[in-house]
């Protein structure tokens, strides 16, 4: 008597999550009677898929009709696959009796899972940092499956290289996560630069996602002071200017500082962007030469973005007042405070 | 090549817990059963139980009210929990894989730690 | 529990010769689909166990052809065609039918 044989033909399927898997299964004969089951996973700690004569299975379905008299067509088909129904599933002919005896099983079939990545996540630094310092950004991405995945970041469109990816778990398992740092190095233009980061998958059909950060929360461009003293006015009043340029955030605050003594405090708002998305702010103080006997030094203190204050001084001579003691600057001005403090 | 490596404390003092970590490199956690056996000084190897991919728990009767094993295949670990020892539960441990074959039986434990000596005592 | 037991427990070896080793269940190791759940384990001194023979007589993966199993049943030998030096150590026989797995209480082998 020719032994029966359980032939499960395909030693792997792939099925896209939400779509319905067919799993091949027949036998080389009739004899002896008894049921065929399906189970994922093998040994003590299987589960029972497909029972076709008995239970409740609301996912899996004969393909062909099993109470057909001389069925030999054991196929099953399971619906909305999750990527939680992946494994290695075998189907098994038992010989009728109390208890019915396993006999034989297939050689088992692999069901594996594609799954989409999900929208790719990424974050910045946690604190800024200025221009020629290195940040790292990290991306994550989960649920996918099969694990192979290509991960790419791009500054302004240019690939980044200094890049480490990590897919795990490094085994076999229903889905995947990726997760990879980029170190970024800033420059003072890079206000208005953007890091993406691209994921493409075999279940994204050439359409790869992409999550983006603005290097704009990563970096703080510190401002360049200029403190300068116009004209004298023939009421013998001097207009010094401090030019606080290319700084970024906005956030600002201006102290003057006469002979050490606070003059004015002030704080930048609603300043309008340079091309490069830093601001500059110009702030004026008019001194009264006539009311000092001595020279008065003015500084201007710079407290950027909760960092230590930067300080510029200027010392107003007193002794002779020529018409000219300083000239105008070129920088942009970009907001004006005069006030007479006499 | 599938290597196991156990970590944990190699003193226990009597009533506490045993916890033991099998970090599983070079393969996959999927389709295998992932095995604690020990063997106390001297003697012969003594099976405690094991954990399938799917989360399925198998423990020697003698050793349930006391044993959990779990996995945590984002590590690609599995732990053993012992609770109450006692200086008896002394023994070097072993994590292991066993193969699984198509049939309801199993396909030999083909793969071992190291071992880990744990001592109770006070 | 599946009982196994082993017999000799001590085995002086002649390198060159051949050895052998019983083993024997308390029930039978035999499935009903044909396949045998009886393993050979040998573990040197100071070493991990390492698995020598799965399904009573299939050799694993880069072990020697001198190791041979056979049996059926309850009853399984494991036969070494010539002992070599470094085949000392203590060799265990066990089921994977049914849980809990369990081991024979191991035969010592060592050079006489």
């Known amino acids: 008597e020719e032994e029966l044989q359980v032939i499960q033909p395909e030693k792997s399927v792939s099925v896209a999550a939400g779509d319905s898997a067919t799993l091949n299964c027949t036998v080389s004969s009739l004899i002896p009677v008894g049921p065929i089951q399906w189970f994922r996973g093998a040994g003590p700690g299987r589960e029972l898929i497909y029972n076709l004569k008995e239970g409740h299975f609301p996912r899996v379905t004969a393909v062909s009709d099993p109470t057909k008299r001389n069925n030999m067509d054991f196929s099953i088909r399971i619906s909305n696959i999750t990527p939680a129904d992946a494994g290695t599933y075998y189907c098994v002919k038992f010989r009728k009796g109390s208890p019915d005896v396993e006999l034989k099983s297939g050689a088992g079939t692999e069901l594996s899972v594609r799954a989409k990545p999900s929208a790719p996540v990424v974050s910045g630094p946690a604190v800024r940092a200025t221009a020629e310092h290195t940040v790292s950004f990290t991306c994550e991405s989960h649920g996918f499956s099969p694990r192979d995945i290509t991960l790419k970041w791009f500054k302004n469109g240019n690939e980044l290289s200094d890049v480490q990816t990590n897919v795990d778990p490094a085994g076999k398992s229903v889905s995947y996560s990726i997760r990879s740092t980029a170190r970024v190095l800033l420059t003072r233009r890079d206000v208005h630069s953007q890091v993406i980061c691209e994921v493409a998958h075999v279940t994204l059909q050439g359409d790869p996602l992409r999550g983006t950060a603005n290097l704009s929360e990563a970096i703080r461009v510190p401002p360049f002071l200029e403190v300068t003293q116009q004209s004298m006015r023939a009421d013998n009043q001097v207009n010094v200017t401090c030019q606080v340029t290319k700084f970024y955030p906005q956030r600002l605050q201006l102290t003057w500082l006469e002979n050490g003594n606070v003059s004015r405090t002030e704080m930048a708002s609603a300043l309008p962007e340079n091309k490069d998305g830093t601001y500059n702010w110009t702030s004026w103080l008019l001194v009264n030469v006539s009311a000092h006997r001595d020279d008065v030094k003015l500084t201007c203190q710079v407290e950027h973005d909760g960092q230590p204050a930067v300080n510029k001084s200027f010392s107003v001579k007193v002794s002779a007042h020529p018409k000219e003691q300083g000239s105008n600057t070129a920088a942009e001005n970009t907001g004006t405070n005069e006030r007479n403090i006499y | 090549q599938v290597q196991l490596q156990e970590s944990g404390p190699g003193l226990v003092k009597p009533s506490e817990t045993l916890s033991l970590t099998c970090t599983v490199s070079g393969g996959s956690i999927r389709d295998y059963y992932w095995s604690w056996i020990r063997q106390p000084p001297g003697k012969g190897l003594e099976w405690i139980g094991f954990i399938y991919y799917n989360g399925r728990t198998f423990y020697q009767s003698s050793l349930k009210s006391r044993v959990t094993i779990s996995l945590d295949t984002s590590k690609n670990q599995f732990s053993l929990k012992m609770t109450s020892v006692t200086a008896a539960d002394t023994a070097v441990y072993y994590c292991a894989r066993v193969r699984a074959y198509s049939g309801i039986g199993l396909d030999g434990t083909d793969v071992w730690g190291q071992g880990t000596t744990v001592t109770v005592s006070s | 529990d599946i009982v196994m037991t082993q017999s000799p427990l001590s085995l002086p070896v002649t390198p060159g010769e051949p050895a052998s080793i019983s083993c024997r269940s308390s029930?039978?190791?035999?499935?009903?689909?044909?396949?045998?759940?009886l393993d050979w384990y040998l573990q040197r001194p100071g070493q991990s166990p390492q698995l020598l023979i799965y399904g009573g007589s299939s050799r694993a993966s880069g072990v020697p052809d001198r190791f041979s199993g056979s049996g059926s049943g309850t009853d399984f030998t494991l036969k070494i065609s010539r002992v070599e030096a470094e085949d000392v150590g203590v060799f265990y026989c066990?089921?994977?039918?049914?849980?809990?797995?369990?081991f024979g209480q191991g035969t010592k082998v060592e050079i006489k």
């Open positions: 029930q039978s190791l035999l499935y009903s689909t044909g396949y045998t759940y």
């Open positions: 066990g089921q994977a039918l049914q849980t809990p797995l369990t």
